[in-house]
């Protein structure tokens, strides 16, 4: 049993003599009727009217009226498409003059049921100028002087110089606030490799393969270790300044205190960490008397070593 066709809902158009025909629906497959399209729309054949057929799959054409879009005149653009007709679903590139473009950095417009999307117009876009680039000891590849948003350009360093990551060439990008960076070509003999590792400590940042002169890297020590020296190292003439040392803490254990019949004064810790230079106060356990000088009960931590007082 072939499904008949209901009265066609022709968007942006209608059947000729619609009211006279409506009572005779649904109709059988094979029937056809003349229809028209509203202003700014046309039939798939490019006319303002045509025939719509009832088929086994429903009405044909499925979209009887298509939007017509005429390409407007572009201020600040190239007008090779000016006045040309495009039909719903068609897209075309918009060619704007340097420094101009479609909103949101788009490059194409599409004829939709509602008209052009986006509207073809060339607006002033964010650009970057070649004259804003300072490059010493290298070259910019491009010949243009103005670059549009998101444009990436290459630069290269002369022999004996390298980019911050040690390559012979690099790139910068035109961003909303100007160039992403200035090209860097540094003397290969002046750059540094990764900073030296230190015992019981580490750098606070992710390490790079190459550092430019005057780069600074910060170190930190593991918990309870004390940093001695500057916590920063600086790259200069291809070498890093002296890194800091991480000084061992003194670990006061219950085992050592029991051996000497002592305990921590005013604390009940079973294990206690003291930094270099810290004073640790001990006292004799109940029933024991000092066997070493009174001064020894105020022991000073020296790079992981502490001299325990003794009680007998």
């Amino acid at each position: 049993q072939v499904k008949p066709c209901d009265f066609p809902d022709i968007k942006h158009g209608g059947l000729f003599h619609e009211n006279m025909r409506r009572p005779y629906f649904p109709v059988a497959v094979g029937k056809y009727y003349s229809y028209y399209c509203d202003e700014h729309f046309e039939t798939p054949s490019g006319s303002y009217w045509d025939y719509i057929h009832c088929t086994q799959n429903g009405w044909s054409p499925a979209v009887p009226c298509l939007r017509k879009c005429y390409f407007p005149y572009l201020e600040n653009g190239y007008n090779q498409n000016y006045g040309r007709k495009f039909v719903q679903g068609n897209s075309t590139e918009v060619a704007c003059h340097p420094g101009y473009g479609l909103p949101k950095a788009q490059t194409t417009v599409t004829c939709t049921e509602k008209g052009w999307s986006p509207t073809p117009r060339c607006i002033r876009v964010r650009t970057c100028s070649k004259s804003d680039i300072e490059i010493e000891n290298g070259f910019i590849s491009e010949s243009s002087s103005i670059y549009i948003l998101n444009k990436e350009i290459q630069y290269k360093c002369k022999p004996g110089y390298a980019t911050a990551d040690g390559n012979s060439s690099g790139s910068i990008t035109c961003l909303q606030n100007g160039w992403s960076a200035q090209p860097i070509c540094i003397n290969s003999s002046e750059k540094c490799g990764p900073p030296p590792p230190i015992s019981n400590g580490d750098t606070t940042s992710f390490l790079l393969k190459v550092y430019v002169p005057q780069s600074r890297v910060e170190y930190q020590c593991q918990p309870y270790y004390e940093l001695q020296g500057s916590n920063y190292v600086t790259c200069s003439n291809g070498e890093w300044s002296e890194p800091p040392r991480c000084i061992h803490p003194c670990i006061i254990t219950e085992e050592n205190m029991n051996k000497n019949n002592i305990k921590l004064k005013g604390r009940s810790d079973r294990k206690y960490y003291a930094k270099t230079g810290d004073t640790i106060e001990f006292m004799c356990k109940l029933g024991y008397n000092a066997n070493t000088s009174i001064l020894s009960f105020q022991a000073v931590c020296r790079e992981g070593i502490v001299e325990y007082p003794r009680c007998e």
Epitope: S141, E142, Q154, C157, K158, P159, S168, S169
Partner: antibody, heavy 114, light 107 residues
């Protein structure tokens, strides 16, 4: 170690086009922007022809600019030289090189003769 | 274009001699200059870059000096394998240009 190898016809007719290719092995053509062509007429000095960046940008010797095209093919890891409207004065050994690290091809002699 | 001139155009010297070749640029090229050696039938090879930096693997008897418009290549003690042609090349500005060369042969 990067190696460069020129290839192309050793004989070109006057007014014809000289076409040479430089195959890069042992490294990626995208790792440098200094892919260069130089030539040396028999018994004479060296002349810089031009260069290409891996993004396709070029710089040419103005004395040859109207006749020369240097292009890069990243998919084949090679770059090429085309010199149009050649005369006997274009007879030379043509070298391709990577200028930054100083890697050279072995050179290829191109003779312009009918 | 920047013109490069070299002197002398040729010289004869003996093994062990100190040899000096001069290169002049028609305008200031800072230190953007390289020196190349080419033996007959062989590929050129860079000896010096940035006017005075020795290319890796090049013997220390080769040295370069100068800045601006006047540059010198010196071979402190000429060896048998140094008999060749020498070219200077400026890479300060496009087009890169080379000197006409200096031929060093055996006296």
């Amino acid at each position: 170690q990067v190696q460069l190898q020129e290839s192309g016809p050793g004989l070109v007719k006057p007014s014809g086009t000289l076409s040479l290719t430089c195959a890069v092995s042992g490294g990626s053509i995208s790792s440098s922007n200094w892919w260069t062509w130089v030539r040396q007429p028999p018994g004479k000095g060296l002349e810089w022809i031009g260069e290409t960046y891996h993004d396709g940008s070029t710089n040419y010797n103005p004395s040859l600019k109207s006749r020369v095209t240097i292009s890069v093919d990243k998919s084949k890891n090679q770059f090429s030289l085309k010199l149009s409207s050649v005369t006997a004065a274009d007879t030379a050994v043509y070298y391709c090189l990577e200028f930054y690290f100083d890697y050279w091809g072995q050179g290829t002699l191109v003779t312009v003769s009918s | 274009d920047i013109q490069m001139t070299q002197s002398p155009s040729s010289l004869s010297a003996s093994v062990g001699d100190r040899v000096t070749i001069t290169c002049r640029a028609s305008q200031d090229i800072r230190n953007d200059l390289g020196w190349y050696q080419q033996k007959p039938g062989k590929v050129p090879k860079r000896l010096i870059y940035a006017a005075s930096s020795l290319q890796s693997g090049v013997p220390s008897r080769f040295s370069g000096s100068g800045s601006g418009t006047e540059f010198t290549l010196t071979i402190s003690s000429l060896q048998p394998e140094d008999f060749a042609s020498y070219y200077c090349l400026q890479y300060n500005n496009y087009p890169f240009t080379l000197g006409p060369g200096t031929k060093v042969d055996i006296k």
